[in-house]
């Protein structure tokens, strides 16, 4: 199809190196083209921003995305040729950073309905640029965390090393949908809630002489709780001796509740005393059985081959730890009788 | 059932003082941030102030900075908007708004709820 009639919008992502970041762009159709087949977010015209992300509806929830080759080869389509790129209905997302993601971007609706369609499309200029060493040093991360039932805010990471008093207007989405516009680098949560993580992206426009960009940077939030103030308490086992058949294979399962730390460094191990010997026993990896917002339970075996006599004198020792402090439960194998 | 009253409109001389209230009649309208608007004769919807119910944050216009407080009373769920050193371009229709999403934020069409309005007039 022909390109020349799609309106035409300049981005620039300026990434960190230092960090893993994500990018997205929104199939932000032109009106008229897009009113009747967008809905409008419950806002009506007179106070609809000229240009919102494409929402899709139920008759259109789809777009196509192709990749206009610099060296004038025909339009790609993007699902075919780069893995690291996904689309999610309306949205494209860069799941990599990278200087290569440069390049022109189309979208179009999937379905041609009225003969305003034919022109209905995007064409989105990517720029995509390392962040150079002169940037700000204490930028804002591209991963930020909100502590549930407190007041919390995300910062605009290509804006985090500007006062308010310098911010441009910013306009915030929050999972594809227009959020608000701020002059202030920065929303704040009065009080935060599971429903306030998500995939946020700021926006705001620069200008040269030549032209103006949008400088988009996308921030993954996440709800989390405080950080535990307890020790890790151990489930299994909860008896300090085992009923075991002698000569046959044992295994000793050791399952423990940790609290959510931010830094999260989990010790769960066995070890082995005998009279005044003590080790620690190789045994397999560790695993997550269970993981809410609030804690994890890891479990960890010891597997003996086949008990013997000498493993009834010894005390079988399940040692778990956080940053807080250590906890252990031992376990003395006794012979089953009859 | 309108969930937001606005009260406490009305003539004023310039340099007077006029005190707004706004009372929520459910819980969850007032949810998140609190925020006064107005609107002149001709003019489209502005910001005025806003407040965050927890966290008691507040945002305010420049044009209002310094003259107006705007505060709340959670016990109430009602919030007012203090004017002090009131001018003639303060003339407007002010509305109260309650956004559930929890941001605070100053975009008029981010908030969920609206009142009615009430009128503020001040004369030269």
């Known amino acids: 199809f022909n390109i020349s009639g799609c309106s035409t919008k300049k981005l620039l992502w300026t990434y960190s190196t230092r960090s893993e970041e994500e990018f997205v762009l929104f199939c932000d159709l032109p009106e008229p083209q897009k009113s009747h087949f967008c809905h409008r977010n419950r806002l009506s015209p007179k106070q609809v921003p000229e240009h919102l992300p494409f929402m899709g509806s139920n008759d259109l929830s789809d777009v196509q995305w192709y990749q206009q080759p610099s060296n004038g080869d025909p339009l790609e389509d993007i699902r075919k040729s780069y893995p690291h790129i996904i689309q999610d209905k309306c949205t494209l997302h860069f799941l990599t950073p990278g200087v290569n993601n440069s390049g022109s971007y189309i979208c179009r609706p999937k379905m041609i309905k009225s003969p305003y369609d034919v022109a209905c499309c995007v064409k989105m200029i990517l720029e995509v640029k390392p962040q150079t060493n002169a940037s700000c040093e204490y930028s804002a991360s591209h991963k930020q965390d909100l502590l549930l039932g407190s007041t919390g805010s995300i910062s605009c990471p290509s804006l985090s090393c500007q006062s308010d008093a310098q911010s441009p207007a910013v306009t915030w989405y929050k999972n594809g949908k227009l959020l608000s516009v701020e002059r202030s680098n920065r929303i704040v949560v009065d009080e935060v809630y599971d429903y306030h993580q998500g995939t946020y992206v700021c926006d705001y426009t620069q200008s040269d002489t030549v032209s103006s960009w949008t400088v988009r940077a996308v921030v993954q939030v996440r709800t989390i709780v405080g950080d535990t103030k307890l020790k890790p308490d151990i489930l299994d086992p909860v008896e300090d001796t085992l009923e075991v058949e002698l000569g046959k294979p044992l295994t000793i399962s050791c399952k423990a509740r940790f609290g959510f730390e931010r830094v999260f460094n989990p010790v769960i191990k066995w070890y082995i005393k005998d009279s005044d010997l003590e080790w620690e026993v190789s045994v397999p990896e560790a695993k997550s059985i269970k993981s809410t917002l609030k804690d994890e339970i890891i479990e960890r075996n010891i597997i003996l081959e086949k008990v013997t006599q000498r493993d009834l004198r010894r005390k079988f020792v399940c040692f778990v730890q956080n940053s807080i402090g250590n906890t252990t439960q031992s376990v003395q194998l006794k012979e089953k009788r009859g | 059932d309108v969930p937001l009253q606005e009260s406490g409109g009305g003539l004023v001389q310039a340099g007077g003082s006029l005190r707004l209230s706004c009372a929520a009649s459910?819980?969850?309208?007032?949810?998140?941030?609190m925020g006064w608007f107005r609107q002149a004769p001709g003019k489209e919807r502005e910001f005025v102030a806003t407040i965050g119910r927890s966290s008691g944050i507040t945002y305010y216009a420049d044009s209002v900075k310094g003259r107006f407080t705007i505060s709340r009373d959670n016990a109430k769920n009602t919030w007012y908007l203090q004017m002090n050193s009131l001018r003639p371009e303060d003339t407007a229709v002010y509305y109260c708004a309650a956004d559930s999403s929890g941001i605070i934020r100053t975009t008029s069409w981010a908030y969920d709820y609206w009142g009615q309005g009430t009128q503020v007039t001040v004369s030269s």
């Open positions: 459910d819980r969850t309208v007032s949810k998140g941030a």
